[in-house]
Interface confidence: low
């Protein structure tokens, strides 16, 4: 599957990148789908996670593959191309002025990426502008070795950021999840994602989302009124991909946000979340870093109860057991807690209305020198029917103006040993966290404690 190397900004001539889409602007490259599919797909999905250092789990509790290990394996697998959609890059300790041994895994990853370029494997990175990591040199280092980097000006285009975190490798393998390209995501922040191997149909579908970012990364790009047909998705909530994952009948599709970055056939991220919630009959378990039934980045903030209402409706109207596990760290905005208490106040076991909210507090311990770390950064939801793994926090802006993706997977129980479906694996990981000593009920988390571990 040979991908022509896309031009970097320096090679792009203004005449090649008209500001107006009426004059035509095609993707930098198009996947050679027929060629890619000559190799038979044998899709496999592996849940991956990062557990912050010094956060021991109970012996024998379920776990997923370590994220750092999975990323290094994916890069070892690469033969032709690695495409990375990322919010920002900060893979080395000096990026943020920190000297800590826990940055070594990130530094090893950066080294591996440089080796990749040395092996003449194409690396294309779409990253956000504006960015969080203004002092990071990772992308300059990679660009100097031949990586193609485009900054996607989401601020100008939608008043948001590119918050996605996914990889497409050789048009066959995928990583997506909550982890940024940041060393802290590997050792200091709790993350959850998925790696899908040998699945060109899904990989090339996610590649189309990467392409939406790529074409918007040229100077003067504007959002098209209608995306050209070659960006369209054939997989969505009405027509998901059907395949065997390790022999298990599976349906899956990728969703995207904001709506302006959803070409024809692409399910909107919010719609995907609501559909998964709406189909639940037994339970909805969600683990998210932030939960605000408001806007977060517009002033004054607006009330936005869409997800809140869906959880309430499921619990109250259908007797679905709702559990919400929310991140709680030194940078958590305390104005979130009244909303969490309000949601939990709906709970009325006598009337078969079950809503429970806890916060997950990662003890800082002796890691206080590392800013913006020691927090549950996950963004996933699981029901008895489906698993949803996303890149968005739960407030309006992440669905209306910020670029993100979601993965919805459903596997059929019964065709394999109990406990093997993706949704069952994800439920076990959720319940491990929910029942751990780091998950604190709201009653035990009085305002003013500032998410400091009291253990």
């Amino acid at each position: 599957w040979q991908v022509p190397r896309p031009p970097t900004w320096g090679q792009v001539q203004p005449k090649d990148v008209p500001r107006s889409w009426e004059h035509g602007s095609s993707p930098a490259w198009e996947p050679l789908e027929a060629e890619a599919r000559q190799q038979r797909d044998s899709c496999q999905l592996v849940l991956v996670e990062s557990i912050p250092q010094d956060l021991p789990s109970a012996a024998g509790s379920p776990s997923a593959q370590p994220l750092g290990q999975a990323w290094l394996q994916l890069l070892d697998t690469a033969q032709e191309s690695v495409h990375v959609a990322s919010y920002y890059w900060s893979l080395t300790g000096p990026d943020i002025g920190v000297n800590d041994s826990s940055s070594q895994l990130g530094e090893a990853l950066l080294q591996k990426l440089q080796q990749l370029l040395g092996r003449n494997i194409s690396l294309a990175v779409a990253t956000s502008s504006p960015t969080l990591a203004r002092t990071s040199t990772d992308l300059q280092v990679l660009a100097a070795r031949g990586a193609h980097v485009r900054q996607v000006p989401m601020g100008r285009l939608t008043r948001g950021v590119l918050h996605s975190k996914f990889w497409v490798v050789d048009g066959r393998h995928i990583y997506m999840g909550s982890a940024n390209m940041d060393w802290r995501s590997l050792t200091q922040v709790k993350e959850l994602g998925a790696v899908i191997y040998n699945c060109s149909h899904l990989a090339q579908d996610l590649e189309k989302t990467f392409q939406t970012y790529w074409v918007l990364g040229v100077p003067k790009a504007v959002l098209p009124k209608t995306w050209p047909q070659n960006f369209s998705s054939h997989f969505n909530r009405f027509q998901p991909f059907h395949g065997l994952f390790d022999g298990v009948p599976t349906t899956a599709y990728f969703s995207a946000s904001p709506p302006a970055l959803c070409p024809q056939g692409r399910t909107r991220d919010l719609e995907a979340l609501l559909a998964v919630m709406g189909s639940a009959q037994e339970f909805i378990y969600a683990s998210v870093m932030e939960y605000f039934p408001t806007t977060r980045f517009s002033h004054p903030p607006r009330y936005w109860p869409v997800l809140d209402n869906a959880l309430r409706a499921a619990a109250f109207g259908k007797g679905v057991r709702v559990r919400l596990l929310v991140g709680c760290g030194l940078n958590t905005d305390p104005t979130m807690f009244p909303y969490l208490r309000s949601l939990q106040a709906l709970s009325n076991p006598a009337a078969n209305v079950s809503v429970d909210v806890k916060v997950f507090i990662v003890p800082v311990g002796n890691h206080s020198n590392i800013p913006f770390s020691r927090v549950n950064h996950s963004k996933f939801m699981v029901t008895e029917k489906a698993a949803y793994i996303g890149t968005s926090n739960w407030s309006e802006d992440y669905f209306s103006s910020t670029a993100g993706v979601g993965l919805v997977v459903t596997q059929s129980p019964g065709a394999q040993p109990a406990g093997a479906t993706v949704q069952e694996q994800l439920r076990q990981l959720f319940e491990r966290d929910w029942s751990s000593r780091y998950a604190v009920g709201l009653d035990g988390q009085a305002p003013g404690q500032d998410c400091v571990w009291q253990g």
């Epitope: 900004w9 107006s20 004059h23 502008s129 900054q151 000006p153 100008r156 003067k220 504007v222 009124k225």
Partner: antibody, heavy 116, light 107 residues
């Protein structure tokens, strides 16, 4: 919020060149286009051109090609416009403007008077 | 280049009135339009971006609407500080082009 601070009033002779500046503060200077706009009384607003400081790409109104030259120094978060071969027609107020939606934030304007 | 036709060129109105200013583009501009305010002897202030969105700090009595090639700025319940010149600007493609302006005067 972005603030744009422009250089002061300029008085110049026909045939001369002048450079005016626009210093940005409050947001990442490299992530939005910086535009320059001309306003003459009774003549409406004319777009001169724009520069994308992130990679120094420029785009000019055909009318001002060869007349205006746009540059930017990212380390100083400052955009510059050099105006050459001045004539009386160049007497006007010149504004820099930028932001994620192109015309969100405006400088206070630089008045250029060309007189012999 | 896209021609932006703005109307009216001026209007005399009273405090408390509601006024609308329109801009017609010579082709569809997909809401890539901004509205600007300029007070006499002063610089410009962005009011609306992307057709309908208020810039930070702009009072909610200002609103924008429209689609395709036709857009409008409405000011409800005019206050004394609203008497100024107003311009539309399209930025769907380079070169950006401006409307000719509307002068709002006190009757």
């Amino acid at each position: 919020e972005v603030q744009l601070q422009q250089s002061g009033t300029v008085l110049s002779r026909p045939g001369a060149s002048v450079t005016m500046s626009c210093k940005a503060s409050g947001d990442s200077f490299t992530t939005y286009w910086m535009h320059w706009v001309k306003q003459r009384p009774g003549q409406g607003l004319e777009w001169i051109g724009a520069i994308y400081p992130g990679n120094s790409e420029t785009s000019y109104n055909q009318k001002f090609k060869g007349k205006a030259k746009l540059t930017a120094v990212t380390s100083a978060s400052t955009a510059y416009m050099e105006f050459t071969s001045l004539t009386n027609e160049d007497s006007a107020v010149y504004y820099c403007t930028g932001g994620y939606s192109d015309f969100d934030y405006w400088g206070q304007g630089t008045t250029l008077t060309v007189s012999s | 280049d896209i021609l932006m036709t703005q109307s009216p060129s001026s209007m005399s109105v009273s405090l408390g009135d509601t006024v609308s200013i329109t801009c017609h583009a010579s082709q569809g501009i997909r809401s890539n339009i901004g509205w600007l305010q300029q007070k006499p002897g002063k610089s410009f202030k962005g009011l609306i971006f992307h057709g309908t969105n208020l810039e930070d700090g702009v009072p909610s009595r200002f609103s924008g609407r429209g689609s395709g090639a036709d857009y409008s700025l409405t000011i409800n319940s005019l206050e004394s500080e609203d008497f100024a010149d107003y311009y539309c600007v399209q930025y769907v493609q380079f070169p950006p082009t401006f409307g000719s302006g509307t002068k709002l005067e006190i009757r």
